[in-house]
């Protein structure tokens, strides 16, 4: 019968021959009267044979990554009968890996979105890098991810690519971070090979700001002649969130004359002093109101950011008329 | 690293002008607004101005207006403080700061997060 | 002109907690930041809009802000807290600091 042994060739061997293994009978006695003879796919192009030994050489530069393994048919002949010795048979040549390949990114540009002051471990994303190496194959595609731009924001798991936040952020300091993430194989260890990728982290806003006015005092007029339902003047606040997040309701906080009143307009997110009853000049020519500004919606775990509205003072001086 | 380095500063008469200048680096200097801030010997911070990113807007302290003028030149990374008929007062550190928030936030709700080492200018006859 | 005022001075055992207060008509519907300043060093931002924690600052450091008072707080206090603290607002777009609090960490 055939005596086998499992046959092994390192991909990219740079030598012009490498010796592979060898074809033996147990009937071979070693006085060559048997021819041995190597078929299939390979069989003369990358490898050859010592038709008097048996023995296996590979004469090509193999890539693991693009052929592991080589089926080949094996037979020895007796020289002096011209028969076979033993059945044609088949056998496998498996070419080794080598560390050859680095991890690479397949799934770029990786771009994720996670809200503003979210807490640490707050899951971001995962990046998930391949090795064309061989994983069965000692650590050549173990891979390691590190982080190499981003602290002291997030942080990378360094088995699973999963990225998380280390630190609180906050969108209105900065509305979006890159970070850079390296995966290495050989678990990290001399002699790794590694590759990088890019990941684009935006946040996304929360309502963490309250609207302020930005002046703490406003001086209106208003004409004695004018009606009820007047819009004497307009007030301001801002609010650096975005979205319904900067939506914002103005109110009368204090009126003791009830005399005005203040709408908000939607649209430019301003207030409207209205007059609410009409005035005169001679029974009062000036008015002092506080209005205040709230935002319209508002969470409940977020309300440590609202504790207290802004308000702001507004004079009004009533404008004499001549009357007949 | 994100750093701001002040110049210019030095000794001068009372009534006559000076200008500091705030080299940035480090950062994208066109998108935050930055402020000087002053500190005279053995006393407490006193905000001077500010200019916004794009030097839309420009505000003093009422101890200034008129006097100073806050610049900058986005193209050099470069902030400065034209400071005109100078008191003795006026003597102090000078500090660069940069406005905390992302352009198209307004106010100074998020304090000034990086200063510069200071320059001091000294009005003396 | 708007004004805040702080104590001048407050002192604080090790390992204690030091508060210092910053007050200012209607304070608490503004925000406030609160700064700390070693001798000859430019000062450095502890604590914005009330309550955050800009990146790298220890959460011993807190603040809270409500009605006239905003106060920043200290907790377990140590030997390198020993330094000059400002509060800082904004009143119709010009800033304003306190006068400043020196805090003694008492050996």
């Known amino acids: 019968g055939w005596v086998w042994n499992q046959f092994f060739v390192p991909e990219e061997m740079n030598t012009t021959s490498h010796h592979v293994g060898r074809l033996r009978s147990d009937l071979d006695n070693g006085n060559n009267s048997f021819q041995y003879k190597l078929l299939g796919a390979g069989a003369g192009s990358t490898f050859i044979i010592d038709e008097r030994t048996g023995d296996i050489y590979a004469i090509e530069k193999l890539d693991r990554e693009e052929r592991s393994l080589y089926i080949l048919r094996a037979q020895v002949i007796d020289i002096t009968t011209g028969r076979a010795v033993e059945p044609e048979s088949e056998f496998v040549i498996k070419v080794s890996d080598i560390n050859d390949n680095e991890p690479k990114f397949l799934d770029e540009p990786y771009e994720a979105i996670v809200p503003e002051m979210s807490p640490e471990g707050t899951l971001v994303i995962q990046v998930t890098a391949s090795d064309a190496d061989d994983p069965s194959s000692g650590n050549n595609a173990r891979l390691l991810y590190s982080l190499l731009q981003g602290q002291p924001y997030f942080s990378v798991e360094p088995t699973t690519g999963v990225i998380r936040i280390s630190s609180k952020m906050d969108r209105e300091l900065q509305d979006e971070y890159w970070v850079i993430i390296q995966a290495k194989d050989m678990i990290g260890q001399p002699g790794a090979l590694s590759g990088t990728t890019s990941v684009l982290i935006k946040l996304s806003d929360v309502n963490d700001n309250k609207p302020i006015f930005k002046e703490s005092l406003y001086r209106l007029t208003v004409s004695e002649s004018a009606p009820t339902g007047t819009s004497i003047g307009t007030i301001m606040a801002y609010d650096n969130d975005i979205g319904e997040n900067a939506e914002m309701d103005y109110s009368i906080e204090e009126d003791d004359s009830q005399t005005f009143d203040i709408i908000t307009n939607h649209e430019t997110q301003e207030g409207i002093v209205i007059l609410k009853k009409k005035v005169n000049f001679e029974h009062q020519n000036h008015y002092g109101i506080r209005a205040k500004v709230k935002n319209h919606h508002v969470d409940e775990q977020l309300m440590k950011y609202h504790t207290e509205a802004s308000t702001t003072f507004i004079k009004i001086q009533v404008e004499d008329v001549d009357e007949p | 690293q994100v750093q701001l380095v002040e110049s210019g500063g030095g000794v001068v008469q009372p009534g006559r002008s000076l200008r500091l200048s705030c080299a940035a680096s480090?950062?994208?200097?066109?998108?935050?607004?930055i402020h000087w801030v002053r500190q005279a010997p053995g006393k407490g911070l006193e905000w001077v101005a500010v200019?916004?990113?794009?030097?839309?807007?420009?505000y003093y302290a009422d101890s200034v207006k008129g006097r100073f003028t806050i610049s900058r030149d986005n193209s050099k990374n470069t902030l400065y403080l034209q400071m005109n008929s100078l008191r003795a007062e006026d003597s102090a550190v000078y500090y660069c700061?940069?406005?905390?928030?992302?352009?198209?936030?307004?106010?100074?709700?998020?304090?000034?997060?990086?200063w510069g080492q200071g320059t001091t200018v000294t009005v003396s006859s | 002109s708007y004004e805040l005022t702080q104590p001048p001075s407050v002192s604080v055992s090790p390992g204690q907690t030091a508060s210092i207060t910053c007050s200012g008509d209607?304070?608490?519907?503004?925000?406030v930041s609160w700064y700390q300043q070693k001798p000859g060093q430019s000062p450095i931002l502890v604590i914005y809009?009330?309550?955050k924690w800009p990146s790298g600052i220890p959460e011993r450091f807190s603040g809270s802000n409500s009605g006239n008072t905003a106060t920043l707080t200290i907790s377990g206090t140590q030997a390198m807290d020993e330094a000059d603290y400002y509060c800082q607002a904004w009143d119709s777009s010009t800033v304003v600091f306190g006068g400043g609090t020196k805090l003694t960490v008492l050996s």
């Open positions: 809009q009330d309550n």
């Open positions: 700061a940069r406005r905390a928030g992302i352009p198209g936030t307004t106010g100074y709700y998020y304090g000034m997060d990086v």
């Open positions: 200019i916004w990113y794009d030097g839309s807007n420009k």
């Open positions: 480090g950062f994208t200097f066109s998108r935050y607004g």
């Open positions: 209607r304070l608490g519907e503004k925000y």
